[in-house]
């Protein structure tokens, strides 16, 4: 790994769990970007593997609202506009970090959590298993 | 919004910036999932809008490694297996939260940051602008 000299102006931490418990400023840098994926692009409707977006809300999580993609079809839309089952619509998933209130219902204490979210769908060639 | 009663066992915060500065436990819940997208699925190679994955590393960020997708072609792969410019490969982007060391090089002090990452690519019908 890369060793970086510690900044002498860093806050102190007396916490016995240090460095597992850290201070985080929730005043988000780059806050003004768009969080509703429907507004930011219409790819979900124009894709050959179109998807619907579902709102997942959890007040114990930060961010409390996450949008989940669900592929509309098992197959993909072909050049004629029909669903073609020779191909598969599959979700593209990504692991993201969220903050989970811990203990529950606490406004100023969180734990990092990794969750897997479906961001959109793509059209793939199916894996064909040949029987001997 | 939903009002949730505060848990009486919550840690106190004397910080003048409260509730902007919070305590976060970095001992990640669900840590054992796979962070290298190449290992978790081969969709990037099997998609009709295939993509390459590029490793983006920043020691001042948590997580320090993020994988970025770059579409391989402007067009998509058609039913014959050829690059076809009647369709477009486009990146599916998602906003994610990361922790940025603030002040820089501090091991226990962070600020939340929103960044836009490309997770994969999908094949879309192009928007055709008709000239009057």
């Amino acid at each position: 790994g890369i060793t970086i000299p510690r900044n002498p102006g860093c806050p102190n931490s007396e916490d016995k769990n240090f460095p597992r418990t850290v201070m985080v400023n929730l005043n988000i840098h780059n806050r003004n970007t768009n969080t509703n994926p429907k507004r930011s692009s219409d790819y979900y409707n124009r894709s050959t593997s179109p998807w619907n977006l579902h709102r997942n809300e959890d007040p114990e999580r930060y961010p409390s609202v996450i949008w989940e993609a669900k592929c509309r079809h098992l197959g993909c839309i072909n050049a004629d506009g029909n669903v073609d089952y020779h191909m598969n619509s599959v979700p593209i998933q990504q692991e993201i970090l969220v903050l989970r209130r811990e203990p529950p219902h606490c406004p100023n204490s969180f734990r990092l959590e990794k969750i897997l979210v479906s961001v959109g769908c793509t059209c793939v060639t199916p894996i064909v298993h040949h029987v001997a | 919004g939903i009002t949730i009663p505060r848990n009486p066992g919550c840690p106190n915060s004397e910080d003048k910036n409260f509730p902007r500065t919070v305590m976060v436990n970095l001992n990640i819940h669900n840590r054992n999932t796979n962070t290298n997208p190449k290992r978790s699925s081969d969709y990037y190679n099997r998609s009709t809008s295939p993509w390459n994955l590029h490793r983006n590393e920043d020691p001042e960020r948590y997580p320090s490694v993020i994988w970025e997708a770059k579409c391989r072609h402007l067009g998509c792969i058609n039913a014959d297996g050829n690059v076809d410019y009647h369709m477009n490969s486009v990146p599916i982007q998602q906003e994610i939260l990361v922790l940025r060391r603030e002040p820089p090089h501090c091991p226990n002090s962070f600020r939340l940051e929103k960044i836009l990452v490309s997770v994969g690519c999908t094949c879309v019908t192009p928007i055709v602008h008709h000239v009057a």
Epitope: - | N45, D80, N82, D84
Partner: nanobody, 114 residues
Framework: QVQLVESGGGLVQPGGSMRLSCAAS????????GAWYRQAAGKQRELVAR???????NYADSVKGRFTISKDNAKNTVSLEMNSLKPEDTAVYYC????????WGQGTQVTVSS
């Protein structure tokens, strides 16, 4: 950077056989078509054989019944089996993946001569 590496070229006697192979690095071939083109000295590049993503094959009239194209997605290769070779098959053979706007190999020389 995507590389298509051709192998198997060289000198062969008329009536002989040769197998050309093309291996792709960094990309999977399952989504792509595969093809072999050739260019003889002083002539234009011509399509010899192609195989679609789903395994449908097409051949130039001059090689039908003598050449066989195949694609192995597991091994990430496109191959050309050439039998009953003739002097007029002498050319630089190029591997192609993904059609005209896809990826091209550097070429391998095939010389049919006694």
């Amino acid at each position: 950077q995507v590389q298509l590496v051709e192998s198997g070229g060289g000198l062969v006697q008329p009536g002989g056989s040769m197998r050309l192979s093309c291996a792709a690095s960094t990309i999977g071939l399952s989504i792509y078509s595969g093809a072999w083109y050739r260019q003889a000295a002083g002539k234009q590049r011509e399509l010899v054989a192609r195989i679609t993503r789903r395994g449908v094959t097409n051949y130039a009239d001059s090689v039908k019944g003598r050449f066989t194209i195949s694609k192995d997605n597991a091994k990430n290769t496109v191959s050309l089996e050439m039998n009953s070779l003739k002097p007029e098959d002498t050319a630089v053979y190029y591997c192609n993946v993904g059609g005209e706007d896809g990826y091209w190999g550097q070429g391998t020389q095939v010389t049919v001569s006694s």
